[in-house]
Amino acid sequence: VTCDDYYYGFGCNKFCRPRDDFFGHYACDQNGNKTCMEGWMGPECNRAICRQGCSPKHGSCKLPGDCRCQYGWQGLYCD
């Protein structure tokens, strides 16, 4: 059985479309599971992995490896 584009698995009922945009950064494995690109995490691979040590409470990042501080916090790790 050959599945339609972006459909995977037995019965072709698993859907996965690789993407690299605001809504996700992932490839699809042979079973149609999302595999996050380097630097991204979460079920949809749309959450950047911040600089190692970046304060989870006072820092955040839009892009992998970044660490942007909340107002009132500073330093390499916003701590």
Epitope: D4, D5, R17, G42, E44, N46, R47, C50, S60, R68
Partner: antibody, heavy 119, light 107 residues
Framework: QVQLVQSGAEVKKPGSSVKVSCKAS????????MHWVRQAPGQGLEWMGA????????AYAQKFQGRVTLTADKSTSTAYMELSSLRSEDTAVYYC????????????WGQGTLVTVSS | DIQMTQSPSSLSASVGDRVTITCRAS??????LAWYQQKPGKAPKLLIY???TLADAVPSRFSGSGSGTDYTLTISSLQPEDFATYYC?????????FGGGTKLEIK
């Protein structure tokens, strides 16, 4: 279970701004974008934009670029939509909405917030 | 931007009828299409996603089909609770635009 609870109805003057909140519960707030969709009285649905609460990244429909600001407060799991320079045609119900698991489109919706713009 | 054209804009039918609503995209959306049902004063409810997959707890009388640019929502046997407005929406790339809606009314 996933719940999105929005702030109450607002009446605003033309030229002013409105800020609508959407409190999320039942899932990890930073794992999914929060989208905003509006519906004018008797009209269809219009996608306005989305925010990734984890890092604050945003995507906006071109029509609203520069007039809408999406923000998120991770500490309270609350997303906000602020619309400025209001005009009468912005009178609408504003919904926050979230994708489902496994790339569903909008499986979860807030109850909607009616914003009335009138002089 | 991809535009969605939905037809008809309104439709009168009777309980038990088979009803078809169509949606055409201005570009290939590769099955990245959803259908929603909306009742007055309520938020839309997801019916179908990825063109043909039924969302949780949606009755099997609803079905979706299509590919490329042309998609169809079919209700095999209308029930009284099905009278509502239906919207298609693509989610291939931002902006995730909706069709104009189809108001399904009792004949």
């Amino acid at each position: 279970q996933v719940q999105l609870v929005q702030s109450g109805a607002e009446v605003k003057k033309p030229g002013s701004s409105v800020k609508v909140s959407c409190k999320a519960s039942g899932y990890t707030f930073t794992d999914y974008e929060m989208h905003w969709v509006r519906q004018a009285p008797g009209q269809g649905l219009e996608w306005m934009g989305a925010i990734q609460p984890g890092g604050g990244g945003t995507a906006y429909a071109q029509k609203f670029q520069g007039r809408v600001t999406l923000t998120a407060d991770k500490s309270t799991s609350t997303a906000y939509m602020e619309l400025s320079s209001l005009r009468s045609e912005d009178t609408a119900v504003y919904y926050c909405t979230r994708r489902g698991y496994d790339d569903y489109p909008f499986a979860y919706w807030g109850q909607g917030t009616l914003v009335t713009v009138s002089s | 931007d991809i535009q969605m054209t939905q037809s008809p804009s309104s439709l009168s039918a009777s309980v038990g009828d088979r009803v078809t609503i169509t949606c055409r995209a201005s570009g290939n959306i590769h099955n990245y299409l959803a259908w929603y049902q909306q009742k007055p004063g309520k938020a839309p409810k997801l019916l179908i996603y990825n063109a043909k997959t039924l969302a949780d707890a949606v009755p099997s009388r609803f079905s979706g089909s299509g590919s490329g640019t042309d998609y169809t929502l079919t209700i095999s046997s209308l029930q009284p609770e099905d009278f509502a407005t239906y919207y298609c929406q693509h989610f291939w790339s931002a902006p995730w635009t909706f069709g104009g809606g189809t108001k399904l009314e009792i004949k």
